[in-house]
């Protein structure tokens, strides 16, 4: 009877070790799986469009990272109280987990589009560079559903990469004409977005608090109307001291207006950036290492 | 040299509406960062914003006479026009064109930096 | 009634100084910078400092703009008898009251 119940235990630690086997081998295959699914897709800058199937709904990137899903590309989401699925670019570099939601890298986008567009989102979404504006309304549906961070990637035409980075960034409602609202800074590009870089000019730089507006729809401090003159949907004030959906410059620029794609705290205002990546994870992220 | 001159009738029946028209020589209307504007002064009184309006058709109006005021552009006649309805005595003014231009960036700021020479419209029967 | 008030008058003699206010309130000057107009008799007005301070190209340095609170002022110094005319302060007042103007102040000089 003992040699009985012994070789139970035997036959079940086995067991055991062979389901932990199993799932490192699911798990392979799944990665394996994708990995040559997207070198399938990936050839050049052809799509990268990444189907899970309905295996699960994901409420950002972080938790397709999470779930296993290693490689960079467009997967659907559904944050908390979106009505409906969408496509995001989730980058899974960078630490991983990534949510983008906006790209500039070409100018092959046009920014200067009205309240609607802003809102529900347009742009390329299916190429890996391509560019897009997520939608205001899914902005919020995101970072309302956890506190994230927010990481804008800069480039310039020089080949010098800079980055700035926020917690605790939240888009408002509707009502609220999707109200930006950012938390601490830190990165090498410098405080554009809360206009810290000098205490006199935040009252008209920072972009802190400050309502979304477009062409028709004008919602900043200034007496004429920024987006139309900046031909951009932005957070303006009056009008800004960063515009990342400005108009697609190969860097020094002369303009009427500082319409171009504008980090001032790096390039100052008559420089348009070549790329540019803003993306959110959550503050508390924590890469789920297999 | 930019230049702006007004155009329309001097004489205007009350509870008619006011017609002017302003031509710009010397630069395209449709140049961005520019809102070309309408302004009047009563006879020996001081100035009076009416409103402005982009080269795209976005338009602005002062708020006391949103009602009665509409203001166009024909870009491809380089022009812009004022329309008042409803006019009274009260409305007896010289009326000026004006271009209002952004003047800085840090923080942006506007103002009327062309005028045109004026045209005195009298409301009267 | 204009929301921006000015002196309607002014003087001064050849060589002197003069100041001319313009007084407003939190949510036109005090939030907002200030532009001044000239108008010589019988002309259209002309921009004579914008931003608060700046003058624009061809404009004298014997014109200088300042503000404090909801209060700006223009200060001709040097007076000179081609600068008898009347001056306008005008400012943005938000989008409930749009552009305004002061009611003018007459200079005249002595």
């Known amino acids: 009877l003992e040699d009985c119940a012994q070789e139970q235990m035997r036959l079940r630690a086995q067991v055991r070790l062979l389901e932990t086997r199993v799932k490192q081998q699911q798990v392979k295959i799944k990665q394996l799986l994708q990995e040559n699914e997207v070198q399938f897709l990936d050839k050049g800058d052809e799509n990268t469009v990444i189907d899970l199937g309905s295996k699960r709904q994901y409420a950002d990137c972080s938790e397709i990272f999470n779930d296993g899903y290693k490689l960079s590309g467009f997967y659907k989401i559904k944050p908390l109280q979106s009505p409906a699925e969408f496509s995001v670019y989730c980058d899974m570099s960078d630490g991983g987990g990534w949510t983008v939601i906006q790209r500039r890298s070409d100018g092959s986008e046009n920014f200067n589009r009205g309240w609607k567009d802003y809102e529900n989102g347009f742009g390329n979404f299916v190429q890996k560079h391509g560019e897009y504006w997520l939608g205001n309304k899914n902005l919020h549906f995101l970072t309302t559903q956890e506190d994230y961070t927010l990481k804008i990637d800069l480039a310039d035409f020089e080949k010098n990469s800079r980055y700035a980075q926020y917690k605790n960034f939240k888009v408002g409602d509707e009502k609220n004409f999707y109200e930006l609202n950012i938390g601490e800074y830190s990165g090498t590009a410098g405080d554009s977005l809360a206009g810290n870089f000098h205490p006199e000019v935040q009252w008209w730089a920072s972009h802190q608090r400050m309502k979304f507006s477009t062409w028709d729809r004008d919602h900043d401090n200034y007496e004429g109307n920024c987006a139309e003159e900046d031909q951009s949907g932005w957070w303006f004030n009056r009008c800004h001291s960063a515009n990342l959906n400005g108009v697609y410059y190969s860097g020094p620029y002369t303009a009427k207006t500082d319409n171009g794609i504008v980090w001032y705290t790096w390039h100052g205002w008559w420089y348009s950036l070549k790329s540019v990546v803003m993306k959110i994870r959550p503050n508390d992220f924590i890469p789920n290492v297999i | 040299q930019v230049q702006l001159q007004e155009s329309g009738p001097g004489l205007v029946k009350p509870s008619q509406t006011l017609s002017l028209t302003c031509t710009v020589s010397?630069?395209?209307?449709?140049?961005?960062?520019?809102?070309w504007s309408w302004i009047r002064q009563h006879p020996g009184k001081g100035l009076e914003w009416i409103g402005y309006i982009y080269y795209s058709g976005s338009t602005y109006y002062n708020p006391s006479l949103k009602s009665r005021v509409t203001i166009s552009v024909d870009t491809s006649k380089n022009q812009f026009s004022l329309k008042l309805s409803s006019v009274t005595a009260a409305d007896t003014a010289v009326y000026y064109c004006?271009?209002?231009?952004?003047?800085?960036?840090?923080?942006?700021?506007?103002?009327?930096?062309?005028w045109g020479q004026g045209t005195m419209v009298t409301v009267s029967s | 009634q204009s929301a921006l008030t000015q002196p309607p008058s002014a003087s001064g003699t050849p060589g002197q100084r003069v100041t001319i206010s313009c007084s407003g309130s939190s949510s036109n000057i005090g939030t907002n910078t200030v532009n001044w107009y000239q108008q010589l008799p019988g002309t259209a007005p002309k921009l004579l400092i914008y931003s608060t301070n700046q003058r624009p190209s061809g404009v004298p340095d014997r014109f200088s703009g300042s503000k404090s609170g909801t209060s700006a002022s223009l200060a001709i110094s040097g007076l000179q008898s081609e600068d008898e005319a009347d001056y306008y302060c005008s400012s943005w007042a938000g989008d409930l009251n749009g552009r305004l103007f002061g009611g003018g102040t007459k200079l005249t000089v002595l």
């Open positions: 004006a271009r209002d231009s952004v003047m800085g960036y840090a923080p942006r700021v506007r103002a009327f930096d062309i």
């Open positions: 010397g630069g395209s209307i449709s140049s961005g960062g520019y809102y």
